[in-house]
Interface confidence: medium
């Protein structure tokens, strides 16, 4: 890759408000590669991190015996980070296809940025309570990885066959849906 295309990092993160802020719907959207893109009349030469999304998750915590009294709210970092000129027709363009080439040496990923530790109380069936310290995500960021980072995790976790497809939009959807699945 040329430096002009990949070396500039802007910290623009898309933050959609999910339609259904319940645990399952937001998590499924994150895991199945649901996309929200911001195309807000930016200058055509502006480079942004397209698609890194902070999804709000609401879930109950259980250790197998006890369950949290109130739901835990946290962020799920989802989507891809794509530093490229924001153009109305960027999906499917030659640049994008080249960028998502399986052999690309540098890729960007939407990852956890900030976390905080909080105590959460669990109610047990016998009437007792337990307190746990857990880490929750509070912000997301785009981070540059080498291809090896991406391939290593895909190697370990992936469920669906990893064959690349020509249309990069489909390919990214396939890889996102397998990200949190089993081999």
């Amino acid at each position: 890759f040329k430096n002009d295309a990949t070396e500039i990092l802007y910290s623009h993160v898309v933050k959609p408000v999910p339609a259904h802020p319940s645990s399952n719907s937001t998590l499924n959207q994150a895991r199945n590669g649901g996309r929200h893109f911001s195309n807000t009349g930016l200058d055509r030469n502006t480079r942004v991190q397209v698609g890194c999304r902070e999804l709000r998750s609401t879930k109950y915590i259980s250790d197998g015996q006890c369950t949290s009294i109130s739901p835990l709210k946290e962020l799920v970092c989802a989507g891809e980070c794509l530093p490229l000129p924001v153009l109305p027709n960027w999906i499917g363009g030659g640049y994008g296809t080249k960028y998502w080439s399986r052999r690309s040496s540098q890729e960007w990923r939407c990852v956890n940025d900030k976390t905080r530790t909080q105590r959460i109380q669990l109610q047990c069936q016998d009437g007792s309570t337990r307190t746990y310290k857990i880490t929750v995500v509070t912000a997301c960021k785009c981070k540059r990885y080498t291809r090896q980072h991406n391939e290593s995790s895909h190697n370990f976790e992936s469920m669906s066959p990893a064959k690349p497809v020509q249309h990069h939009r489909e390919r990214k959807r396939a890889s996102k849906s397998s990200k949190h699945s089993m081999s």
């Epitope: 980072h149 290593s152 066959p161």
Partner: antibody
Framework: DVQLQESGPGLVKPSQSLSLTCSVT?????????WNWIRQFPGNKLEWMGC???????NYNPSLKNRISITRDTSKNQFFLKLNSVTTEDTATYYC??????WGQGTTLTVSS | DIQMTQSPSSLSASLGERVSLTCRAS??????LSWLQQKPDGNIKRLIY???TLDSGVPKRFSGSRSGSDYSLTISRLESEDFADYYC?????????FGGGTKLEIK
Amino acid sequence: DVQLQESGPGLVKPSQSLSLTCSVTGYSITSGYYWNWIRQFPGNKLEWMGCISYDGSNNYNPSLKNRISITRDTSKNQFFLKLNSVTTEDTATYYCARGGLLWGQGTTLTVSS
Amino acid sequence: DIQMTQSPSSLSASLGERVSLTCRASQEISGYLSWLQQKPDGNIKRLIYAASTLDSGVPKRFSGSRSGSDYSLTISRLESEDFADYYCLQYASYPWTFGGGTKLEIK
């Protein structure tokens, strides 16, 4: 049901090459996934050696880079580990695995004269 | 390479007890950590991946969590089949690297 089965000579002399085979049933190695070799030394330390992907590309552990080769025979649905110039330090149980979830049962290899 | 420091190296516990094993990563691994169980016959089974996601068929008494660079495997109530060796594995980048293992024995 997907299964992986390692096979090999059991005993190799120092300075020779070792060759192991992982036979895969129930899934084509060209259809997807990455296919790994991992070994476990006496004393139970585990080491990832390398992998071959569904499209035939490789990644190797840098500690073995000059000695290791992972190849495949798609017609037999097998992939192979070749390790050159072995020493007694290569005595271990060798596992093949599909991704991180499906592991073979392991084959023990001893390097001794 | 990323070093994985696992503790304790051995642990004696009783049936029904709650136990926790810990792994610390020498570099950021962004939650790309798995826990493996190895039975005395040598068979290796993945229990957890992505730090806290339980594999299909793994009993709910197993759970994984993360606090910074520390990752934990907790077994809420030990059963006889849980006495085995446990390894953490980071797969954030190649080469994958393993913790030194924890031998979980019956007290």
